[in-house]
């Protein structure tokens, strides 16, 4: 699929999307992972689910429905806030924390009815309950009533290291896959390209060994890395040329302090 919107997309009606990429078609990419994602459908003017392959694709792809709506539906934020302030909290906001049956250690948020705040908790990955949000924003919007909580709420801190019995697992080495970390990342203002080009190379979660390329924003070059076949992030290209074409264009030449340690 093309990374640009089709010409025909501009004729779809009066509703203009907030961003040009919202007009792009859903693109599952060439990889074979099966990741539940969301895209904005220009034909229906709604955010819809699709299965993403795990690499490449385009910017019309979101991890959550909420993120998609916020990014691509004009006026959505205002109506969402209005609804939240005027309506009662859904029943599921009052459900107790449920890590679920599985033990996958995922960072999630829930509404704590005692503290009246959204807090971070560890979700096991399957079969919990609906008081379980992928982002703090989503939790606040649905369960923290803005009328009753005018002051900003501090997120309850939890270490990015999750204790598993007596051992401590660093998230970057899950499944014994060491994720290469880029030592230097350009300041956001120095990079105007696709946001995923700033992400570190991510080998993913499976066991294959595929040659891929990622854009190193510190060096401005595309480097080789081994991809395991699923998961990972969008900074993942099948050829060096594709990688450069997608990411190199966004770098703004800065004579002095282009990178931050």
């Amino acid at each position: 699929l093309s990374e640009e919107a089709d010409d025909t997309d501009s004729e779809l009606g009066s509703m203009k999307p907030l961003h040009t990429f919202c007009a792009m078609k859903a693109d599952d990419g060439p990889c074979k992972a099966m990741i539940r994602s969301y895209f904005f459908n220009m034909y229906t003017h709604q955010c819809e689910e699709f299965i993403y392959g795990g690499c490449e694709g385009n910017e019309n792809r979101f991890d959550t429905l909420e993120e998609c709506k916020k990014t691509c539906i004009p006026g959505y934020e205002k109506t969402a806030v209005k609804a939240a302030s005027g309506a009662e909290r859904p029943d599921f906001c009052f459900l107790e924390e449920d890590p679920g049956l599985c033990r996958g250690y995922m960072k999630r948020y829930l509404y704590n009815n005692q503290t009246k705040q959204c807090e971070r908790f560890v979700y096991g990955g399957c079969l919990g309950n609906r008081n379980n949000f992928e982002t703090l924003d989503e939790c606040k919007k649905i369960c923290e009533n803005p009328v009753h909580s005018p002051s900003p709420v501090n997120e309850v801190q939890m270490s990015d290291y999750v204790t598993d019995g007596n051992t401590v697992t660093d998230r970057s080495t899950v499944n014994n896959i060491v994720v290469p970390q880029s030592p230097k990342v350009p300041r956001r203002r120095d990079y105007r390209g696709r946001p995923w080009c700033l992400q570190p190379a991510d080998s993913g979660l499976c066991k294959a060994s595929e040659r891929r390329f990622y854009y190193n924003s510190a060096t401005g070059k595309c480097h080789r890395f081994n991809y395991t076949g699923c998961g990972g992030n969008n900074n993942n290209f099948t050829t060096r040329r594709r990688c450069l074409r997608s990411c190199k264009t966004g770098l703004i030449k800065n004579k002095s302090k282009g990178v931050v340690k």
């Epitope: 990741i35 539940r36 299965i51 049956l101 033990r103 990955g125 079969l127």
Partner: antibody, heavy 123, light 112 residues
Amino acid sequence: QVQLQQSGPGLVKPSQTLSLTCAISGDSVSSDSAAWSWIRQSPGRGLEWLGIIYKRSKWYNRYAVSVKSRITINPDTSKNQFSLQLNSVTPEDTAVYYCARWHSDKMWGFDDWGQGTLVTVSS
Amino acid sequence: DIVMTQSPLSLPVTPGEPASISCRSSQSLVMSRGITYLNWYLQKPGQSPQLLIYKGSNRASGVPDRFSGSGSGTDFTLKISRVEAEDVGVYYCQQYDSYPLTFGQGTKVEIK
């Protein structure tokens, strides 16, 4: 090697309570890497999940809506077992009842099953 | 409830030949990390069910490599590359995307 040994009566009268026990060896009912379930099988309904309990920071349970008002699954940590109680039974509850362990770590699934107990509800 | 529909319900097989069982769910069983919330079980005659495949495509310990699971979204397949006599029994798919946990109605595999 985990083993689940079921015990309980094979015949229950209508309107009475069906009680079964599942004794665990090779694992702990309080393990935070497992969950403990009851599933039944009848010719008419196939495999039907009834409910599950699991211990994390505290005990949790979940029941199928079809039996929610009548079912209780309890752990017995002192004997390392868990039990099923199904109240107000009818002939519709006639089935082979299985206890099973849900593996919570890498292998998400019912990886160990009891031998099954045929329970007939009849007067 | 998520409804799991298997086909065929009965599958006569010839030893040494491949076999394939289909399972369809009434809603998608794929989560954001690419894990598929689907398992396969085999219940041999007179025995309790045993776990064959977990998370859609991973073989449980001790399961021969002639068994493989695949599929995404709502359509899943269990394949046996070369059927052996000991593979007879009823095969079930099961979802754990949401409560209640539900099973397919079963596919009975028997030797021709």
